[in-house]
Interface confidence: medium
């Protein structure tokens, strides 16, 4: 025997109080699939959360974060404060990156500068709080008598032979 509730579409619930008739979801609730025996309460985007998509009878509301905050977690379950580049968020708020570390985003933690010497390279551009160091060629490449670094040949479009 087919379950009569299977005929109830999304946006309704199968109402046991009324002979398993399909009742519309009450306001502020939704059912995203058919055959449900209750509707689900719509998510409310309050406080630091903003409504990105309104709740409908068939789909939940979606939230994002007010300016100055960014989403964390599945479905933007949390809003975390933005910091400036060159800072990281701590329990005491936004703090500048310590010397030797950087953060080039408004979120996340300060990360150590790349250690160029581990790859046998020299520092071409010093790091800052906002930017990682830029590693240059290895000292051996710069020693007298070393062959000069030739720039790569420009790429050709396929099917074009050199003139």
């Amino acid at each position: 025997l087919q379950d009569p509730c299977s005929n109830c579409p999304a946006g309704t619930f199968c109402d046991n109080n009324r002979n398993q008739i399909c009742s519309p979801c009450p306001p502020n609730s939704f059912s995203s699939a058919g055959g449900q025996r209750t509707c689900d309460i719509c998510r409310q985007c309050k406080g630091v959360f903003r409504t990105r998509k309104e709740c409908s009878s068939t789909s939940n509301a979606e939230c994002d974060c007010t300016p100055g905050f960014h989403c964390l977690g599945a479905g933007c379950s949390m809003c975390e404060q933005d910091c400036k580049q060159g800072q990281e968020l701590t329990k005491k708020g936004c703090k500048d990156c310590c010397f030797g570390t950087f953060n080039d985003q408004k979120r996340g933690i300060c990360r150590p500068w790349t250690n160029c010497s581990l790859d046998g390279k020299s520092v071409l551009v010093n790091g800052t709080k906002e930017r990682d160091v830029v590693c240059g060629p290895s000292p051996a490449d710069l020693s007298p008598g070393a062959s000069s670094v030739t720039p790569p040949a420009p790429a050709r479009e396929p099917g074009h032979s050199p003139q």
């Epitope: 619930f13 306001p27 689900d40």
Partner: nanobody
């Protein structure tokens, strides 16, 4: 026992007005979420309007916004639906219903009245 009893339906011309009443017993309308649901001939149920939470936030379906007004009289423990600028497509049986929230997070209507028929016709 929780009961709802609607009244006020009838025949009205297009553009006319009606006020539906829903007398509640066994619970207090000011402390519950209650609303109106309708069923047009041969159609499914459609929620029309509701008063949610003790603050009295009101909700309306797009099809009735600006024409219908939901209200309640706490002293009389009665819910009302003032309907104006009525159209032929508003013809339906109107039910009042109590909205309940289940422990698992689900939402349903748990108590219905017997309904009152509104016919909009010239």
């Amino acid at each position: 026992e929780v009961q709802l009893l609607e009244s006020g339906g009838g025949l009205v011309q297009p553009g006319g007005s009606l006020r539906l009443s829903c007398a509640a017993s066994g619970f207090t309308v000011s402390a519950e979420d209650v609303g109106w649901v309708r069923q047009a001939p041969g159609k499914g149920l459609e929620w029309v309007s509701a008063i949610l939470d003790k603050g009295g936030s009101t909700y309306y379906a797009e099809s009735v916004k600006g024409r219908f007004t939901i209200s309640r009289d706490n002293a009389k423990n009665t819910l009302y639906l003032q309907m104006s600028s009525l159209r032929a497509e508003d013809t339906a049986v109107y039910y009042c219903a109590r909205i309940v929230y289940h422990a698992g997070g689900g939402v349903t209507f748990d108590t219905w009245g017997q309904g009152t028929l509104v016919t909009v016709s010239s």
